[in-house]
């Protein structure tokens, strides 16, 4: 019969012959022959291969270097790589997570819209009218101005996006 020019899924062509690929978590030891199946071997400790493959070497698991502020979020297996994340207060610079960035704080006049995670930074928003933030914080939302009326007081000093209103006693001399 004619030698194949293409092979089925999970196979590869070698020496005019279709051989089975090694399954995830295993590496190629020797190609199949007319008489033998493809020979595969499991990846060693701290190694992985995440696809059907014909690799002769497994990939090393990623090292989450604590010197870079990294820690293991998910331990690797023979079929998956280790996933790193950053220590508390920091987030990954990129999807690859090879280094970390300090979470930013929201300046006075801005509040936290979304708290940072291991993979995303703090998202800040300007405090709208009626709200304020007088601190630089990675957690604090904009706070509503104090309602003087509910305390039977009057506004003595208007609030801003950075300061609360100042309440004072009602003027007793009203006619």
């Amino acid at each position: 019969p004619e030698p194949p020019t293409a092979c089925r899924e999970k196979q590869y062509l070698i020496n005019s012959q279709c051989c089975s690929l090694c399954q995830p978590g295993q590496k190629l030891v020797s190609d199949c022959t007319e008489f033998t199946e493809t020979e595969c071997l499991p990846c060693g400790e701290s190694e992985f291969l995440d696809t059907w493959n014909r690799e002769t070497h497994c990939h090393q698991h990623k090292y989450c270097d604590p010197n870079l502020g990294l820690r293991v979020q998910q331990k690797g297996t023979s079929e998956t790589d280790t996933i790193c994340t950053c220590e508390e207060g920091w987030h990954c610079t990129s999807e690859a997570c090879e280094s970390c960035v300090l979470h930013r704080s929201c300046s006075p006049g801005f509040g936290v819209k979304q708290i940072a995670t291991g993979v995303s930074d703090t998202i800040c928003e300007p405090c709208p009218v009626g709200f304020f933030s007088n601190v630089s914080s990675a957690f604090e939302k904009c706070h509503p101005w104090t309602s003087c009326e509910t305390k039977d007081l009057v506004v003595q000093q208007a609030g801003t996006n950075k300061t609360d209103v100042v309440c004072g006693p009602q003027d007793r001399l009203r006619a």
């Epitope: 270097d65 010197n67 870079l68 502020g69 220590e87 508390e88 207060g89 610079t93 990129s94 999807e95 690859a96 090879e98 280094s99 960035v101 300090l102 930013r104 704080s105 930074d121 630089s136």
Partner: antibody, heavy 116, light 112 residues
């Protein structure tokens, strides 16, 4: 080998702008933030802000917020710092520095002189 | 902003003698994650700064072990056990606990 190579010295007039480049090589550009630090003559170090080349997200020192623009070009692995409305006090050496576990690599510095 | 204050600002030292530089922060640099975000850099004459110590006490790669860093949340010390001629320059402490990142004024070490 990691290298950060900055553009050459600049002489600018007050009120104008300057754009300094920092070309990175020897590592994956998008995996580390690039910070900018300046040093006025005979003075100490002052942090200006950083750009995350992966997200193009900048974070500025409020002192420079309205005058500085940090950008990054992934295709050429180059970071840029543009400072506008220059005044004589902006005369300084401007450094780019990569943040790994610290400022582990620095550019050679770019001298910007602001003079009428 | 966190203020970093160094002392002394000038430090003449005889080669072979020890040297000590102090750095104080206006706020504790000890994070709730257990790390202290204090860094030491040396800027040799005519050069860019270079890292000496990170996270208060960890020696950077390639830095001689005559350098050491120690401290608490707000008071930090850089020690050189035996000063050599190549150690001359300006030493800076820096905090990376929060933005903006801030540096000390610098301590100029010179050989007597």
């Amino acid at each position: 080998e990691v290298q950060l190579v900055q553009s050459g010295a600049e002489v600018k007039k007050p009120g104008s702008s300057v754009k300094v480049s920092c070309k990175a090589s020897g590592y994956t550009f998008t995996s580390y933030t690039m910070h900018w630090v300046r040093q006025a003559p005979g003075q100490g170090l002052e942090w200006m802000g950083y750009i995350n080349p992966s997200s193009d997200y900048p974070n500025y020192n409020q002192k420079f917020k309205d005058r500085v623009t940090l950008t990054a070009d992934k295709s050429t692995s180059t970071a840029y710092m543009e400072l506008s409305s220059l005044r004589s006090e902006d005369t300084a050496v401007y450094y780019c520095a990569r943040w790994g576990y610290s400022f582990d690599y620095w550019g050679q510095g770019t001298t910007v002189t602001v003079s009428s | 902003d966190i203020v970093m204050t160094q002392s002394p600002l000038s430090l003449p030292v005889t080669p072979g003698e020890p040297a000590s530089i102090s750095c104080r922060s206006s706020k504790s640099l000890l994070h709730s994650n257990g790390n202290t975000y204090l860094y030491w850099y040396l800027q040799k004459p005519g050069q860019s700064p270079q890292l000496l110590i990170y996270r208060m006490s960890t020696l950077a790669s390639g830095v001689p072990d005559r350098f050491s860093g120690s401290g608490s949340g707000t008071d930090f010390t850089l020690k050189i056990s035996r000063v050599e001629a190549e150690d001359v320059g300006v030493y800076y402490c820096m905090q990376h606990l929060e933005y903006p990142l801030t540096f000390g004024q610098g301590t100029k070490l010179e050989i007597k």
